[in-house]
Interface confidence: low
């Protein structure tokens, strides 16, 4: 979002006394930030602290296990995607504090706000890969026993990252800085050069590929998995399945406002009251989507505590227990293990 295609947040309320000696603005109240922006700043601050520390810890825990545990590969890649996105937060935070002034240059404008979209695509593609893995473990256990290996997992992750980069290119290409000096400031946003059709196309592609299609396919996927699990009387699903379902659900919950407002803004006339309202909520929607970047470590810790009964272990060992659990394939009465995942404790079903 944050486009000036011209669909910026209200960029006309920042007075940068350092760059130009303007006469006193009439509307002095506009020096204060709007409530949605203040909320966005609070969310950004929390997400940055939890996201950087949490994901760094997840990376540290899973990196050592990634050679031998496929689940660790999945969680490692998710954590890297989230960690990368969190690195942009201090810059985005600073920009909002300065009423959306962007003093960081054109390259930063193209790259940093695009990181959250890269995260969105990388996360959903990785989650789709993980979900396919869970699906195969349940419905094709013999195939998994023969072919499910770390090498294939890394290839799948590389494909997911490659596709994510490709899908982020439109946002990256249309991001530009624009100077405004009443009040003096540099704006960073998306410029579709008044081409509403192009803007709509980007918004639709983002909604379909980054939200609706994954929502549909993953819902079907997990419906089948859960039905099979329950039909086999495996009422206690493994930690990994519960954790993955929680991660998938949180993805859709936290991206929903961004996607809804994005598609609405692309179809609304920029002069309409609804559009102007949505514009003001833009930063808040972005910050809400950013919660995805810190929620996974929280899910892992909550899951770990749930499985441990109470938090007896250290945080790293608790995370290790959740993130590096071996996938034990159960089909009929036989238990078979992945040839790669050989060092795990036995846990029931899926």
């Amino acid at each position: 979002m944050d486009s000036f295609n011209y669909t910026t947040p209200d960029y006309g309320h920042y007075d940068d006394k350092d760059t130009l000696d303007l006469n006193t603005p009439v509307d002095k109240t506009s020096n204060t930030l709007r409530v949605p922006d203040i909320l966005a700043l609070v969310i950004f601050a929390v997400v940055f602290l939890v996201g950087v520390l949490g994901n760094a810890l997840v990376v540290w825990v899973t990196a050592f296990e990634a050679k031998r545990t496929i689940n660790a590969i999945w969680f490692l890649n998710l954590a890297v995607a989230d960690f990368l996105s969190c690195l942009a937060l201090p810059i985005l935070f600073t920009s909002i504090v300065q009423h959306h002034h962007w003093p960081f240059g054109g390259a930063a404008c193209s790259i940093l706000p695009s990181l959250i979209l890269l995260n969105m695509y990388a996360s959903i593609l990785l989650l789709a890969t993980i979900s396919a893995d869970r699906f195969l473990l349940v419905f094709k256990p013999i195939w998994c026993q023969n072919f499910r290996g770390a090498g294939l997992a890394w290839i799948a992750c590389a494909v997911a990252w490659g596709l994510a980069l490709l899908l982020t290119i439109p946002s990256f290409l249309y991001r530009v800085v624009r100077e405004e000096y009443f009040p003096p400031k540099v704006l960073c946003g998306v410029d579709y050069s008044h081409d509403k059709r192009r803007e709509r196309a980007v918004a639709i592609v983002r909604l379909v590929l980054g939200f609706l299609w994954p929502l549909l396919t993953l819902t079907i996927c997990y419906t089948f998995i859960l039905l099979r699990t329950w039909s086999r009387r495996a009422t206690r699903s493994t930690k990994t399945l519960k954790v993955v379902v929680a991660v998938v659900a949180s993805f859709f919950i936290f991206w929903l406002p961004y996607q809804v407002t994005g598609i609405m803004m692309s179809f609304l006339e920029p002069s309409s009251p609804t559009f102007l309202l949505l514009k003001k909520l833009d930063s808040l929607c972005v910050s809400f989507a950013y919660i995805n970047c810190c929620i996974n470590p929280i899910i892992y810790v909550v899951a770990g505590q749930g499985f441990q009964g109470r938090l007896r272990k250290s945080l790293p060992s608790l995370l290790r227990n959740v993130l590096t659990e071996e996938s034990v394939v159960r089909e009929s009465k036989s238990f078979t293990r992945s040839t790669v995942d050989t060092m795990a404790q036995k846990t029931q079903a899926v």
Partner: antibody, heavy 119, light 112 residues
Framework: EVQLKQSGGGLVKPGGSLKLSCAAS????????MSWVRQTPEKRLEWVAT????????YYPDSVKGRFTISRDNAKNTLYLQMSSLKSEDTAMYYC????????????WGQGTSVTVSS | DVVMTQSPLTLSVTIGQPASISCKSS???????????LNWLLQRPGQSPKRLIY???KLDSGVPDRFTGSGSGTDFTLKISRVEAEDLGVYYC?????????FGGGTKLEIK
Amino acid sequence: EVQLKQSGGGLVKPGGSLKLSCAASGFTFSSYTMSWVRQTPEKRLEWVATISSGGSYTYYPDSVKGRFTISRDNAKNTLYLQMSSLKSEDTAMYYCTRGGGNYDAMDYWGQGTSVTVSS
Amino acid sequence: DVVMTQSPLTLSVTIGQPASISCKSSQSLLYSNGKTYLNWLLQRPGQSPKRLIYLVSKLDSGVPDRFTGSGSGTDFTLKISRVEAEDLGVYYCVQGTHFPHTFGGGTKLEIK
């Protein structure tokens, strides 16, 4: 196509008031800083007022400060200039201009509306 | 305020001949970001002004390439390589570096 259509000019007595309007089309009005510029009978151009894209900030030269008020209605894509306590030296052709970034400041001009202050 | 001084006041040129207009500012127009916000406008008879050039030398879309802008600091020039009938009117320079915007007095281009 960017268009700025002006209305509201006319003859007014000294001390009187007048409101000029400028209807914008062909661009996203709410994203641009907008200005009023006047051209005196001697053909000199003079900046009169500027308003930020969201309408929060307004700027005036000392010659009109306290007498002129620039405003905008982004929902209606319209820019306004309320002129009060008019003086004879305010007699001019008034133009509304589009100005956002420095590079596109005053890149498009309205057709102009004549204001004559005379007793 | 920054004073913009244009010369000459009137310029009489034969069609097909070159023309040059000068604009001097009382202060440097180089902004802190390294850009110089000097624009040229043309006001044809009975019309509103139209911007021709921005950032000293960048031509607006639809402006013929016979127009060129140059200069830096406080001295700027607008050149027309071959004057055509449609070029007649009053040319104004305007600066946007310092608050407020200020305009030159104008140079009237006449056809001989």
